[in-house]
């Protein structure tokens, strides 16, 4: 029996739980979702039984095989998918378990600025990148672009220290999850720091 396989799916997209059956004469295959019966395929893809009406149009077995394709994915399709392969040549059914996580496509990440100080002509602040709807498993990367630098910084918070008179810099936050990626509007260091320029010791949000 196989190990647990992690599968990612995109909202409204489709996912295939692949099943490689070789050297076994299959009698039937049973698929379950969170322990509830989902579908059964009998000998050589001849008969397909799907009990729930809501799943009938979404469940498919491509190329007459036993691999399960689930379309029009919804958030509540996330969960454990279990397959049992039954054969007279096996004493016990062969099994495989999958964990599906359905992710949303990411919208543009939002950037907020932390407390800003401007001392001795240097503007110091933090930029924080986040998704407005609290999407799961998002990885953040910052790109700092400019004549003096082209750097990447991992994590949602980017510490900035920019000196007046230096060439301008542009900061872009890139958000990724397993199914999509998106980037923020660019932020220019000069514009960001302009607000604190009048009062060299100011701190502002």
């Amino acid at each position: 029996s196989g190990t647990l396989k992690k599968v990612a799916g995109a909202l409204d997209g489709s996912v295939t739980f692949t099943l490689n059956i070789t050297e076994i004469k299959v009698d039937y295959v049973v698929w379950t979702f969170n322990t509830f019966f989902l579908a059964m395929v009998k000998k050589d893809g001849g008969t397909i039984i799907v009990t729930q009406n809501r799943n009938r149009e979404r469940v498919d077995f491509p190329d007459g095989g036993y691999s399960l394709k689930l379309s029009k994915l919804k958030k509540n399709d996330s969960g454990i998918y279990y397959v049992g392969i039954y054969s007279s040549s096996l004493q016990q059914p062969s099994t495989q378990e999958y964990v599906l996580h359905v992710y949303e496509h990411l919208s543009k990440p939002k950037v907020t600025m932390g407390l800003q100080s401007n001392k001795n002509g240097t503007c110091v602040t933090n930029l924080t990148c986040c998704m407005e709807h609290g999407e799961e498993d998002v990885i953040y990367t910052w790109k700092a672009l400019g004549q003096a630098a082209n750097e990447s910084h991992n994590g949602s918070i980017l510490p900035i220290s920019w000196r007046w008179g230096e060439s301008d810099m542009t900061f872009i936050c890139v958000a990724r999850n397993p199914v999509s990626r998106n980037f923020s509007s660019p932020i220019l260091a000069r514009k960001l720091c302009e607000g604190a320029a009048d009062d060299p010791d100011s701190s502002m949000v």
Epitope: V7, A8, G9, A10, G13, V15, Y103, H105, K143, L145, S152, T170, I172, V174, R176, P178, V179, S180, R181, F183, S185, P186
Partner: antibody, heavy 119, light 107 residues
Framework: EVKLLESGGGLVQPGGSLKLSCAAS????????MSWVRQAPGKGLEWIGE????????NYTPSLKDKFIISRDNAKNTLYLQMSKVRSEDTALYYC????????????WGAGTTVTVSS | DIVMTQSHKFMSTSVGDRVSITCKAS??????VAWYQQKPGQSPKLLIY???TRHTGVPDRFTGSGSGTDFTLTISNVQSEDLADYFC?????????FGGGTKLEIK
């Protein structure tokens, strides 16, 4: 050395089908989004579509969505483009391309494979 | 779809000159623009991304500028090896789109 090598091009009749392959080497293919881009003779570049690392997301240029299917096999380090219902305007050089650092601009291109649609 | 227009199909210049290739987006794309060079018989090569950041190994005579809808690739001190087609690409929204290209000819 990072390399992409397309194959499978050739002469195909209008209405026919063809499957192009792109073999990747020199980098961790399973971590990258991958794209197909085509270039008609003497013309500009046209992005066909992209596929994410685990094949859970595939984005296409809308006008090509119904005739092209992008897929990949990470175990074989190979990207595919299944073309169907081809027409003369699909005659082009087909490139596979890798985005730099998984961003949206392409730093690695294959040499391309030529598809000619003609009766 | 966002249309990227490169109004000059051909541009002629001399070695040592400075030339500017322009690209106009049909709507605001921020700075999500890349430039590529394609020499005859070769695959495209990335020059510039995020409108103005030079890709690794690209000579500093290639400079990108612009934001919003208007973008420029400037080649200063043009060399004979710069004879090529130049394409802009937007990646602000799907589908990614390219300009029609500008062929740079050396007098």
């Amino acid at each position: 050395e990072v390399k992409l090598l397309e194959s499978g091009g050739g002469l195909v009749q209008p209405g026919g089908s063809l499957k192009l392959s792109c073999a990747a080497s020199g980098f961790d293919f399973s971590r990258y989004w991958m794209s197909w881009v085509r270039q008609a003779p003497g013309k500009g570049l046209e992005w066909i579509g992209e596929i994410n690392p685990d094949s859970s997301t595939i984005n296409y240029t809308p006008s090509l969505k119904d005739k092209f299917i992008i897929s990949r096999d990470n175990a074989k380090n190979t990207l595919y483009l299944q073309m169907s219902k081809v027409r003369s305007e699909d005659t082009a050089l087909y490139y596979c391309a890798r985005p730099d650092g998984n961003y949206w601009y392409f730093d690695v291109w294959g040499a391309g494979t030529t598809v000619t649609v003609s009766s | 779809d966002i249309v990227m227009t490169q109004s000059h199909k051909f541009m002629s210049t001399s070695v040592g000159d400075r030339v500017s290739i322009t690209c106009k987006a049909s709507q605001d794309v921020g700075i999500a623009v890349a430039w590529y060079q394609q020499k005859p018989g070769q695959s495209p090569k990335l020059l510039i991304y995020w409108a103005s950041t030079r890709h690794t190994g690209v000579p500093d005579r290639f400079t990108g500028s612009g934001s919003g809808t208007d973008f420029t690739l400037t080649i200063s001190n043009v060399q004979s090896e710069d004879l090529a087609d130049y394409f802009c690409q937007q990646y602000s929204s799907y589908p990614y789109t390219f300009g029609g290209g500008t062929k740079l000819e050396i007098k």
